[in-house]
Structures are given as C-alpha cells and as structure tokens.
C-alpha cells in the first residue's frame, strides 16, 4: 500500500483557498477506502490535530469543528481511492504538516498508510489599483472614474499590480469589461486582453482580431504598471473596466498554482458614438433665383465630434433631386475624407465650387444657375473612424432636411417653319431646304442653333430607326456635319439672323426621306458655360428626288 500526496512544501496565501490531493494504491480490501486528515502545527510538531475524515463525522478536533460544520473545510471524494482536502479561506495557523492517513483494510500490514506534505501560509501582499492612463479621454473626478471617449478615439487604461511576497512568484494581469451596471463576477466579466505570467499577451475571444490587427495593445511599463490601449473605440466597448491580477507560484512538482487573485475597478467608460452626435443643417432657406445668377448653399456639420485627424475623418457632399423625383437624386459635388473635391456626373465643365469655409461649414457655389439646377438640395455628411491601422470605417452618416431651390425659366418660345425651295427636285440637282425661326422672350444675347435631321423610308414605310443628323450650325456659329444618306456633299449655313439653309448636292435616290429642322436657343453665362433655354421642331419636309425623263 502507498499513500500519495503532493510534494512539498506548498506555499499558499492567507485568505485564499487550497486543495491538497491524496490517493492510495496497492491496497487490499474494498474499492472505497477511507481517509483521515491531520495537521501538525510548527509549534507542536508531535501533536496530530484531526481535521476531517471520510468515515467519522465527529472526527474533527475543536480547532476545526466549526469550520468543518460550516463547510469551509471539507474532504471531497474524487473516487474510491482518491480524495482532496479543501480549505476555503486559509488562516496563518493553518500552516504546518498535513498528513493523509488511510485506515488499514489489508490482511497484512504492508507499505505506508499515510503521506505528509508541508503547507506554508504566506501573508496577502498582492495589491491592485487603477493607474492614471495618461492624457486620454475626459475623466470625471469620481471613484471609480467615469470616462467618455469618442468613437474611433483611443481608450487607454492603466493598472498598478504589485506583490511583495518573499517567495519567487509571477504576476498575470488581465483587463476585463462588464456591461454597465452589471454585477461583477467571472461569468459577467469578459476578458479583453491579458498578460500572462510568462509575459505572453492574449486577448479574449471577441478581441483577438483587434489584437492581431494592432488595434488593441497591452504593455508593461516599469515594474508594476500595465497599460491597455484600445485603438479605435467602438460602441460595444462601453462598460465597466476591471483589472485582475493573479499571483502564481511553481510547486515542487513543477506545476504552477495560482495563490492569489485581486481585482480593481478601473473606470466606467462611455463611448460617444458618431451616429448619436452627427447632425447636418443647411441654409439659407428656400432659394428663388434667376438663370445665370450664382447659387450659394451652406452646410453645417454639428455635434460633439472628434476633430478630423488621426482617428476621425469626414466627407461632405451635396445631392440634388429634381422636383418630385424620389430618392437622394444625384451627386452635385463632394469633398472627400482627404479634402479632394469632385463634381458629380453632368456637372463637369461647369464653374462649381465646393469648399470648407469654417471648421464645420461647407459651401456649394454654382457660378451660374440654370433652370435644370432647380430641385431639392440636401447635404450629406459621413463620419469615418480609423483604428490604429490606416483603414477608415464608415461610422455614421446624416442628411440635412431638403432645401428647395427654384430657378426661373428663361421663357423662350421658338417656332420653326421649314420648306423645300422650288418644291420639286430632280436627281443630280441640289436640294435647298430652308428653315425660318421665330423667337419670343429670352434675355439679350440669346444665340440660336439649328440642326437638320432625316428619317428615311424602308420599303415605302418610314423606318423605326431614329432620325439621323444630317448637319447643323451650333450657337457658336460652327457647322457640324452628320451623315448624308446618299453620301454626297452637304452644306449648312446661316442665310439670315433667323434663317438656316441645308443644301444636298447631287441628289440621289438614297436622299429620299422626311427632313426636319430643330432649332435651339442658348444662353451663355458669366462662367462661359452654355445652357439650352428652349427648343423646337419644324414640320416635316419631304424630299423625293424625281428622275428626269432622260433618265428612263
């Protein structure tokens, strides 16, 4: 028979729990063996004090009786031949030599019937407290402090953990978070990050990714100061933060045992989310302007927002929806997170400026408004946060209320009358088509353009192919030639201030078709851009190249 207990001496700390195992091998008799625990105190090394037994409930000496009855000291059977002695809260007088004895069930008295191990009780000298983390976040002078950090900003917390235990021990320090107002315990405390006794850094499951990405850091500064930094605070980082220090010692058998643990509340942390703060307003109110006049709109981004920089960035854009159109419409202009301005589709080539005029105020200026600029304008602001990497993450966006903009129409009315000079044309001749344009209204300096179009018959029917441009004269007086069905020469010209002519030289059968004239009125603004103020379409003019009698 052999009774086995751990190799000693064992060092444990007053006030903590201790477990000492005992098992028996090589015995005869029933599988379920009985165990008795005794203590030999240093001041009376020959006196065995009965602690607890698996067989006799009245076994305990007076010094242990009350603690056994209270369940603070107990023997727990693991199996028939193994038990563990558990002492919930060690006292200094619990130091001494512990003996595990197994009453004999053997036919012959052979081997050892007890095993001894020394337990030394160390004073509780582990200290844990909050340390000022440095100038990060706003801290209210309460205990524990309340801290408010902006989403995306750094959250830094410090912890002081030290021990003056005379033996060689190691400290493991971890930072944990519990949801605000929740009771703190192992089940409610979620580990954020910890530094093990071997100085390895480990993160709790939800934080492992952030640790790997460098967004979460934990370091030891000096002998007893630990600092945790959460790179880009997120809404889910709010809560009560704790620091837990655990003291570990290496037992003679080589295994490590935790001999003390203490926890301190570091801070109640509130994360001010950008989505709860970001607000966008526009001004001035509803605008009514004339064509060619400048349109200026202001956008103000407000809220308790972190400044643009290392942790946060902003983009601001203007959207325009034509009156009655659903959705955000189209993008007019945007200043991106790097301050680069861009004009949206349809606005390139126009004199439009989008600029930051104050720390949170942005201006959109259209140098010369057009009727097509009328609609509902909104300012859209987006807030981005950056972790400790360079990656930006969109954290919030807000749109202003709609701002109606009205641009008066020019009131230009065009009419066009077109005809074929001479009425009848023959193959090989030149067909002259004339277009007279009448204009009512419009500003001074109105320019006219006119283009000529043809629809060709296919098998005697007008084709479903859209009309083709034959040629025209732009508002700048420059002629543009399209495609002539017959492929011969074409000339377009202005023959009077309101009169345009199209000539088709050397007519062929392919030139047969229905032609029309399409005038348009153009206004040039101060920024030299043009916009179309009106358009019209003449009635159809049929061109049928007849054959001369000689052609038959």
């Amino acid at each position: 028979r052999e009774v086995l207990v751990p190799e000693g001496p064992l060092y444990r700390v007053a006030g903590t729990a201790v477990s000492i195992s005992c098992n028996v091998t090589g015995y005869e008799g029933p599988a379920q063996q009985n165990f008795e625990w005794f203590l030999y105190r240093p001041e009376a090394p020959d006196t065995a004090l009965g602690i607890v037994s698996t067989k006799d409930t009245q076994f305990s000496y007076a010094v242990f009786k009350s603690r056994v009855v209270a369940g603070e000291v107990q023997v727990q059977r693991l199996q028939g031949d193994a038990v563990v002695l558990k002492i919930a809260r060690l006292q200094a007088q619990d130091a001494g030599i512990y003996e595990c004895h197994t009453p004999s069930t053997d036919t012959r008295y052979l081997g050892s019937y007890s095993g001894k191990v020394e337990l030394r009780v160390l004073p509780d000298v582990l200290q844990v407290s909050a340390a000022p983390p440095g100038p990060r976040g706003r801290q209210a002078p309460t205990s524990p402090p309340r801290m408010t950090v902006h989403e995306g900003q750094e959250l830094a917390l410090g912890c002081l953990a030290r021990t003056s235990t005379q033996k060689h021990t190691h400290l493991a320090v971890s930072f944990g978070r519990s949801v605000p107002e929740a009771p703190v315990g192992r089940s409610t405390l979620q580990e954020v990050v910890g530094i093990r006794s071997d100085l390895a850094v480990e993160a709790g499951a939800p934080y492992a990714e952030r640790l790997a990405a460098g967004e979460l850091r934990l370091g030891k500064e000096g002998t007893d100061r630990y600092r945790m930094v959460v790179g880009g605070a997120q809404a889910g980082d709010a809560g009560t933060y704790h620091c837990t220090a655990a003291e570990w010692i290496q037992d003679p058998d080589g295994s490590w045992a935790q001999i003390a643990e203490k926890r301190a509340v570091l801070a109640h942390v509130d994360v001010q989310t950008l989505s709860s703060q970001l607000a966008v307003t526009v001004g001035p109110g509803e605008r009514r302007i004339g064509p060619g006049e400048p349109l200026e709109l202001l956008c103000n981004v407000s809220g308790a927002l972190p400044p643009a920089g290392r942790h946060a960035a902003y983009s601001v854009g203007w959207e325009m929806a034509p009156a009655g159109a659903p959705g955000p419409g189209r993008l007019v202009a945007q200043l991106d997170t790097e301050g680069v301005g861009s004009l949206g589709p349809g606005y390139e080539g126009r004199h439009i400026a989008m600029e930051k005029v104050a720390s949170r105020t942005y201006r959109l200026r259209l140098e010369a408004a057009r009727p097509g600029d009328a609609g509902t304008y909104r300012c859209l602001a987006k807030a981005y946060v950056r972790g400790s990497g360079t990656r930006l993450r969109e954290a919030a966006s807000a749109r202003s209320r709609p701002l109606p903009v009205h641009v008066r129409e020019e009131g230009v009315v065009l009419e066009a009358v077109a005809w074929l000079a001479g009425g009848t044309v023959y193959r090989g001749e030149t067909a002259s088509l004339l277009c007279n344009i009448s204009v009512r209204g419009g500003p001074p300096g109105l320019r006219l353009a006119a283009s000529w179009w043809v629809e060709r018959p296919e098998d005697g029917e007008l084709s479903s192919v859209p009309a083709q441009l034959v040629g025209g004269v732009g508002q700048d007086g420059v002629a543009e030639l399209g495609v002539r069905p017959g492929g011969g020469p074409v000339s377009v010209e202005l023959v009077g201030p309101r009169s345009h002519r199209l000539r088709l030289h050397s007519l062929g059968p392919e030139d047969e078709g229905v032609y029309h004239c399409a005038p348009s009125a153009w206004v040039q603004h101060a920024d030299y851009s043009w916009y179309q103020a009106g358009s019209a379409r003449s009635g159809p003019v049929t061109v049928y190249p007849y054959m001369h009698a000689l052609d038959t």
């Epitope: 993008l331 861009s342 949206g344 589709p345 390139e348 080539g349």
Partner: antibody, heavy 120, light 108 residues
Framework: EVQLVESGGGLVQPGGSLRLSCAAS????????MSWVRQAPGKGLEWVSG????????RYADSVKGRFTISRDNSKNTLYLQMNSLRAEDTAVYYC?????????????WGKGTTVTVSS | DIMLTQSPGTLSLSPGERATLSCRAS???????LAWYQQRPGQAPRLLIY???YRATGIPDRFSGSGSGTDFTLTISSLEPEDFAVYYC?????????FGGGTKVEIK
Amino acid sequence: EVQLVESGGGLVQPGGSLRLSCAASGFTFSSYRMSWVRQAPGKGLEWVSGIGRSGGRTRYADSVKGRFTISRDNSKNTLYLQMNSLRAEDTAVYYCARAIAAGRYGMDVWGKGTTVTVSS
Amino acid sequence: DIMLTQSPGTLSLSPGERATLSCRASQSIRNNYLAWYQQRPGQAPRLLIYGASYRATGIPDRFSGSGSGTDFTLTISSLEPEDFAVYYCQQRSNWPPTFGGGTKVEIK
C-alpha cells in the same frame, strides 16, 4: 448626342504596333479625364490607361506600362492609345470611356469598342 | 492593388424576381468610390451606379446600390427581360482602378 467612336483595331503580329483613336462628340471633351478599358475574349473588364483633361497626369496598368502610351488632342476631340511590343495577351476589345470626377465616380460614356487581335 | 470579389458568379432568376449582387473589396474603399456597370452581350458596359449608391442618369429606379467599407451590394428590385446581363463593380479608391470578375444574371 454624346458619343465616343473607337477605330484603329485590327490583326497584328506579336511585337508589332497599333494606334487606336477615339473620336468624341456631343460634349466638351477637354472637361473630362479619359480612359481606355479592355476586355479579353470571354473575360472581364480591365482598366488599361487614363489621361488628365489637359493631357497630363497619365496612368497605366502594370501590364502595359512601358509599352502603351495614352495621349489626346483636345483641338480634335480625339483620344489615342499607341500600343507597341504587342503580346498575345493584349488581344481584346478596347473601349474608350469618359471618366467622371477623374474616374472617382466611374465611367459614364463608353464607345462600342475596337478589336485588337495579336497573333502570328 | 485592391481586389474586388463578386458573388455569386452566376445568378439564375426569373423575370419579376429580386436580384442581389455582392461585391467585396480586399481593403476598405474610401469615400465609397465604387461604381456598378451592366454589360449586355456584344455591347459596351453601361454605368448604373456611382458613389456606391447614386443612380446614373437615365437608370431606372429598380436598380439601387448600397454598402460601405469593404461590402457593397447592387439590388435589382424586380428583374425585367433586358436586365439579364453581366454586372461588374469597379473601384477608384486606390490606383490602379480595378474591376470585379462580374456576376452573370441569367434567365432561370
């Protein structure tokens, strides 16, 4: 009508050269950054090169750098792509495209494309 | 280079059904500089969406774009016969501009 029309494609031997042209009409050509995008048979789209409004700020995909040159003539409303040292993998339909906000908002007008075949 | 991964590769749906196409970037797309194109067989691409969520001129409102950061979505609320085509996403957050591999929307 806003329009882009490519030309200049054809069959060329490996190591040979081609010059593609793209004629623009219906818009103020000089107000836009322009790009060339290609599509190999049965494959996806690949951006090839881009050029700034005044002809500066040229950029190229790594696959064509040093072999292709993009240029433009704003007086003729025309974009060009000079392709030298052509390889079999350059076989594709080449599209000319108008970029919005220097391409930050994509390309809103595309030509019908011109086919370049590099084969011996 | 930013890699754009489109999924699924092929989407088999019937006219009238809703189509959801995904585009995932290998790194964050700043300022939502992402566009979507439609390409019908034998035709040039056509811009549908720019700035991740703005419809290009003349694009029907059954097309909508959403997303930010690395995950973007093109939704066609009710497929019309002419919507069966290949769809590409494209980024211009970083040089060079890159396209996704495309999603083919075919008739079931």
